[in-house]
């Protein structure tokens, strides 16, 4: 459906408020260092222009593509060269190369100050003084720090952010009302950002086919009563939505996501019995709810998979005629029967099935060759099951903090070249799998754990891609999307690593550690643990435990001392000496 003016079309579809919010998100995700005021100015200019096009679609420049309009606007920023360096070269290109250039310069780890939360009264005053600016600032700060955040979902977060302030700034105890809500939004936001980052990496690094396979598996688990044709339609539409958002086409993405939610709700009878409540909600809540909806019940009496995919005489004929469709059917049928499997496991099974058919359908006796293909699935299923069982036992034994420490040691030994902040961040997140998933019954553990680990390992991959330092990380990240976790699990201690020189400064602590939150104190200790392993990769668990116990005791002692700074200086020296002796440094 070609429109004379794309910008007018999207403005009318989305409405002014959403249009402005989405343009702000798009600009902040591209130009992550630009001041808030500059972005607001650009957004206002684009909005005014859009209104002229709504009034007259034939007006000058209204027929230009959104990429052309937005790119031209971004390229008017005066300080582009000084602030962004070579990104300014994008402006010399024509569309579509210019947009691709901007996309390539998105920074997953921008050099931006940590967001410090002001006092509640200060926030409430700012909210009341200028609600619109306050909410725009939220969108801007999140978008520039998370350049792949799913834009329509960020609108939903902003709506909840506004609701929290509207309610809590009138409450008797503002802080008690507001802070838990803000903590929840922060944690959910980080999780949402990381999940979307994996979708974009899947599309950008492994292509549309990889994303579609993921979507077939996930939607088939979620909607096991839906027909294959229905699931295929949803997959096609969902792929379009995410391709657009990952490509910076946020207006189209939000518009298409709304259309998809509308379609799903209009056809819930042929999709899932679990959608009723979601479909009664307003648009943003509806889309979020559908994305998170629980799996529908599996239809009763589903026939054996073997009949169509092993025993049938038409297996090779069907495969040869439409390979991806046939594999899609296999994935759909397997996934709808196995809500207890992770999506990545289902994709490994489909890949094994595909490899077998490729080999066997070209053989003299195809059926004889592929007759035992399902037997090849057993070890693939047992590997994550065993890994999750072992790690949940370890988590239950140690608790989250010490489980994270065990993973910190494990991963630092595997890939010691990776930067300490990245190892700490990734291992802490890997460790959260315990509290997130181990509480679940057996049937829900694997999809929870392994699909969560895929999201966390993708964080490692995108951070490492920015400044590659380890061939092993590059190999695990690029060879196979679905085998990333098994690839990292299989890594042993890196025997080629030359231990880091000892630097006493790394292990010098000050009284400021005493005023940190428990979480920040843990991060300090975990940073020290990573550095210890980098100095002494062959240190045993017992040696490291002893040093960390001494370190915890040292911090506790000095934080209780009258002269904290002196205590840290004197006791710190003793601790470093004792640790060096204990580790044989």
């Amino acid at each position: 459906d070609a429109h004379k003016s794309e910008v007018a079309h999207r403005f009318k579809d989305l409405g002014e408020e959403n249009f402005k919010a989405l343009v702000l998100i798009a600009f902040a995700q591209y130009l992550q260092q630009c001041p808030f005021e500059d972005h607001v100015k650009l957004v206002n200019e684009v909005t005014e222009f859009a209104k002229t096009c709504v009034a007259d679609e034939s007006a000058e420049n209204c027929d230009k593509s959104l990429h052309t309009l937005f790119g031209d606007k971004l390229c008017t920023v005066a300080t582009l060269r000084e602030t962004y360096g070579e990104m300014a070269d994008c402006c010399a290109k024509q569309e579509p190369e210019r947009n691709e250039c901007f996309l390539q310069h998105k920074d997953d780890n921008p050099n931006l100050p940590r967001l410090v939360r002001p006092e509640v009264d200060v926030m409430c005053t700012a909210f009341h003084d200028n609600e619109e600016t306050f909410l725009k600032k939220y969108l801007y700060e999140i978008a520039r720090r998370h350049p792949y955040f799913y834009a329509p979902e960020l609108l939903f977060f902003a709506k909840r952010y506004k609701a929290a302030f509207t309610e809590c700034c009138q409450a008797a105890d503002k802080a008690a009302c507001l802070l838990p809500k803000l903590d929840e939004l922060r944690d959910e936001g980080k999780a949402s950002s990381a999940k979307q980052r994996l979708k974009c990496a899947s599309l950008q690094k492994f292509g549309e086919r990889a994303f579609k396979a993921w979507a077939v598996a996930r939607l088939s688990q979620r909607f096991p009563k839906a027909e294959f044709a229905e699931v295929s339609k949803l997959v096609t539409d969902l792929t379009k939505v995410h391709t657009e958002c990952c490509h910076g086409d946020l207006l189209e993405c939000a518009d298409d996501r709304a259309d998809l939610a509308k379609y799903i709700c209009e056809n819930q009878d042929s999709i899932s019995s679990k959608l009723k409540e979601c479909c009664e909600k307003p648009l943003l809540e509806k889309s979020h709810c559908i994305a998170e909806v629980e799996n529908d019940e599996m239809p009763a009496d589903l026939p054996s998979l073997a009949a169509d995919f092993v025993e049938s005489k038409d297996v090779c004929k069907n495969y040869a005629e439409a390979k991806d469709v046939f594999l899609g059917m296999f994935l759909y049928e397997y996934a709808r029967r196995h809500p207890d499997y992770s999506v990545v496991l289902l994709l490994r099974l489909a890949k094994t099935y595909e490899t077998t058919l490729e080999k066997c359908c070209a053989a003299a006796d195809p059926h004889e060759c592929y007759a035992k293909v399902f037997d090849e699935f057993k070890p693939l299923v047992e590997e994550p099951q065993n890994l999750i069982k072992q790690n949940c036992e370890l988590f239950e034994q140690l608790g989250e903090y010490k489980f994270q420490n065990a993973l910190l040691v494990r991963y630092t030994k595997k890939v010691p070249q990776v930067s300490t902040p990245t190892l700490v961040e990734v291992s802490r997140n890997l460790g959260k799998v315990g509290s997130k998933c181990c509480k679940h019954p057996e049937a829900k553990r694997m999809p929870c754990a392994e699909d969560y680990l895929s999201v966390v390992l993708n964080q490692l991959c995108v951070l490492h891609e920015k400044t590659p330092v380890s061939d092993r990380v590059t190999k695990c990240c690029t060879e196979s999307l679905v085998n990333r976790r098994p690839c990292f699990s299989a890594l042993e201690v890196d025997e080629t690593y030359v231990p880091k020189e000892f630097n006493a400064e790394t292990f010098t602590f000050h009284a400021d550690i005493c005023t940190l939150s428990e979480k920040e104190r843990q991060i300090k200790k975990q940073t020290a643990l990573v550095e210890l392993v980098k100095h002494k990769p062959k240190a045993t668990k017992e040696q490291l435990k002893a040093v960390m116990d001494d370190f915890a005791a040292f911090v506790e002692k000095c934080c209780k001392a009258d002269d904290k700074e002196t205590c840290f200086a004197e006791e710190g020296k003793k601790l470093v000496a004792a640790s060096q002796a204990a580790l044989g440094l």
Epitope: A229, S232, D314, C316, K317, N318, Y319, A320, E321, A322, K323, V325, F326, M329, E358, C361, A362
Partner: nanobody, 123 residues
Framework: EVQLVESGGGEVQPGGSLRLSCAAS????????MVWVRQAPGKGLEWVST????????VYAESVKGRFTISRDNAKNTVYLQMNSLRAEDTAVYYC????????????????RGQGTLVTVKP
């Protein structure tokens, strides 16, 4: 739009040979499996042979196995059917076909098909 144009049909005596060709356009030929089906007078569509996108996999109906050979040239966007030892029961209109998105695999009425080429085997 998808176009399939068959050629090479004709009249031949039992035991004779023919080579059918099908020129394809309007879709990505090199990633598409191709099929030959036939329709004898007064009968329904009958599957004859299938070749995979990369030509590694070829499958034949029992009735033609050992006599017919399917092949393709991805550089020329063409699929072939070499028919040897022809019999009277091979008389039919032969169609070249390819899967149409949204249809059921093996439901040849729903596939993209050409207009067909007539093969007549008679003494």
């Amino acid at each position: 739009e998808v176009q399939l144009v068959e050629s090479g049909g004709g009249e031949v005596q039992p035991g004779g040979s023919l080579r059918l060709s099908c020129a394809a356009s309007g879709f990505t030929f090199s990633t598409s499996g191709m099929v030959w089906v036939r329709q004898a007078p007064g009968k329904g569509l009958e599957w004859v042979s299938t070749i995979s996108d990369d030509a590694r996999i070829t499958v034949y109906a029992e009735s033609v196995k050992g006599r017919f050979t399917i092949s393709r040239d991805n550089a020329k966007n063409t699929v072939y059917l070499q028919m040897n030892s022809l019999r009277a029961e091979d008389t039919a209109v032969y169609y070249c076909a390819t899967y149409r998105a949204g249809s059921r695999i093996g439901s040849y009425e729903d596939y993209y098909r050409g207009q067909g080429t007539l093969v007549t085997v008679k003494p």
